[in-house]
Amino acid sequence: MEDTKESNVKTFCSKNILAILGFSSIIAVIALLAVGLTQNKALPENIKYGIVLDAGSSHTSLYIYKWPAEKENDTGVVHQVEECRVKGPGISKYVQKVNEIGIYLTDCMERAREVIPRSQHQETPVYLGATAGMRLLRMESEELADRVLDVVERSLSNYPFDFQGARIITGQEEGAYGWITINYLLGKFSQKTRWFSIVPYETNNQETFGALDLGGASTQITFVPQNQTTESPDNALQFRLYGKDYNVYTHSFLCYGKDQALWQKLAKDIQVASNEILRDPCFHPGYKKVVNVSDLYKTPCTKRFEMTLPFQQFEIQGIGNYQQCHQSVLELFNTSYCPYSQCAFNGIFLPPLQGDFGAFSAFYFVMNFLNLTSEKVSQEKVTEMMKKFCSQPWEEIKTSYAGVKEKYLSEYCFSGTYILSLLLQGYHFTADSWEHIHFIGKIQGSDAGWTLGYMLNLTNMIPAEQPLSTPLSHSTYVFLMVLFSLVLVIVAIIGLLIFHKPSYFWKDMV
């Protein structure tokens, strides 16, 4: 009886000891986790901001970027928080009304004032980069380009931000910064291998994407070719980013943006028109528009087609024929002369295409409008859809897209045809390599374009060498240390109990 009582007590005790051990272990885990997490709770983040104005040929856009200050050199930490499109045309159109530039920029600069905390205003850098529209104005007159930029600078200096200047960026820079932007956002510069991918288009390899940028006045192609040696040093760039060397090919085709390409085509076609009516296959049937000859010859892009015409105006009459439009567009590309092993057009060196390409800016806007950005749409299907779209009567088009400004709406047939011609005949993409072109608007909420790359460069946020960093963040490290410490403590306690009183511990538990 006594023996039974004693064994019951022992059983009760051993069970209770186990329960107490378990309970206290859980409490300890919770306590240690709480302490660990509280201890490592991030301090209020020190956020930095940057503003870049993209002064394009057709309009100006303001971009606001933000990033955690302590992670400045990390890859992929900068992201866009705001885009503000300035109402009105590009700054180059303000030559005759420079006094209006201040008002022109007001809305978007005020928006920046609202978005960025007041305490950050004075240390927020503002950069304005002007592209091909201003390059063309400078080509006509350095004085006029300077005057526009001077007024822009004076206007931007009136805001509480840290204004860093307005300048005309080169075509090479435009191409290079676009390439940096998309690869930065796609995580291509990160040397860490990722277990999973949250970025669209991202393959787990670190092969960079090529960049295809289309603006109103120029177009850029930038990529890392397979062959590291280049036949044309003017098109070669060397970068060292995050500890890796990149030999990049880039070229900017001035006058081959969609708007200037259209002016070129009109100037070329009017040369052979028998009267002041231009029957144009690149506009929908039934479309009519009067063009001033003086406007046609205003741009340096039409200089080669300039001639004395017996009329001051002519009328475009749309006939909507994709095939004829395509043929007319091809005449803008001189492929008869190439002083290199391979050229794009107009005697410009182009190495064999390599890898995937991100096509952004107007490449994306136009193709997105035409609903042709899907990865699943083949080049043949795109051509078919373009044929169908261009042949639709203008009245029908206006009804179908009632919310779209007629000026833009009327030009989608030309722009779509031009994009196909440029990619296929200009850059030598094929029906097979078409699938390597990804039409991209945004990557993780940031617009694809040159502005982010420009800011990253000017703020020295892309280090040449890979920053020295621990494999784990501090908080993860502490958390794992606590967890493993607990496991070890518990295992040690149980181990001690087992080894010191094995018979007592296991009694009645079998």
């Epitope: 080509m139 006029l144 340096p300 080669r304």
Partner: antibody, heavy 116, light 111 residues
Framework: QVQLVQSGAEVKKPGASVKVSCKAS????????MHWVRQAPGQRLEWMGY????????TFSQKFKGRATITVDTSASTAYMELSSLRSEDTAVYYC?????????WGQGTLVTVSS | DIVMTQSPDSLAVSLGERATINCRAS??????????MYWYQQKPGQPPKLLIY???NQGSGVPDRFSGSGSGTDFTLTISSLQAEDVAVYYC?????????FGGGTKVEIK
Amino acid sequence: QVQLVQSGAEVKKPGASVKVSCKASGYTFTDYNMHWVRQAPGQRLEWMGYIVPLNGGSTFSQKFKGRATITVDTSASTAYMELSSLRSEDTAVYYCARGGTRFAYWGQGTLVTVSS
Amino acid sequence: DIVMTQSPDSLAVSLGERATINCRASESVDNFGVSFMYWYQQKPGQPPKLLIYGASNQGSGVPDRFSGSGSGTDFTLTISSLQAEDVAVYYCQQTKEVPYTFGGGTKVEIK
């Protein structure tokens, strides 16, 4: 830095043609127009015409229309000015100058002597 | 064509003294609020060197003693304190419209 280097001096007979070259470096060749200006001995500077290198379009002073031709080779970043049907009054130093409206950079000049 | 008339044809100034050259255009060379007027310096055997652009802006590397003024049709180049190295021929030019035209030149010498 921007540099414009011109070809050497030429001696030509009346009625012949001369072609002067101007090699540019230090900037994107197609971003700026190239002008040609000449200066006869002891005379004022005389603007002849210009070319838009990005597409080869050109404009001339009425005086030189039909007799002067300006061309470019963009792959070599070089502009050329050819003057035909030379006469003794074409003896001059021929300059290339980069610019839209501001001639900030000039070649060193090429002396063309027209003599029978 | 816009005719550019320079005066005087030649000018002798003592070292350290002010030299003033005038240029008159046959019509206004202003457009869009900019004066398309330029001044060049040319020394024997050398190409012209841009001194002043847009009527009053100094070219890069041009000493402060050179200044330009004027608008419309009347323009002036001033050398505030003549130095020995300033001996040269000075030309005005308009690029408002084609054909771009030059003045006849002013020869500056030391008195």
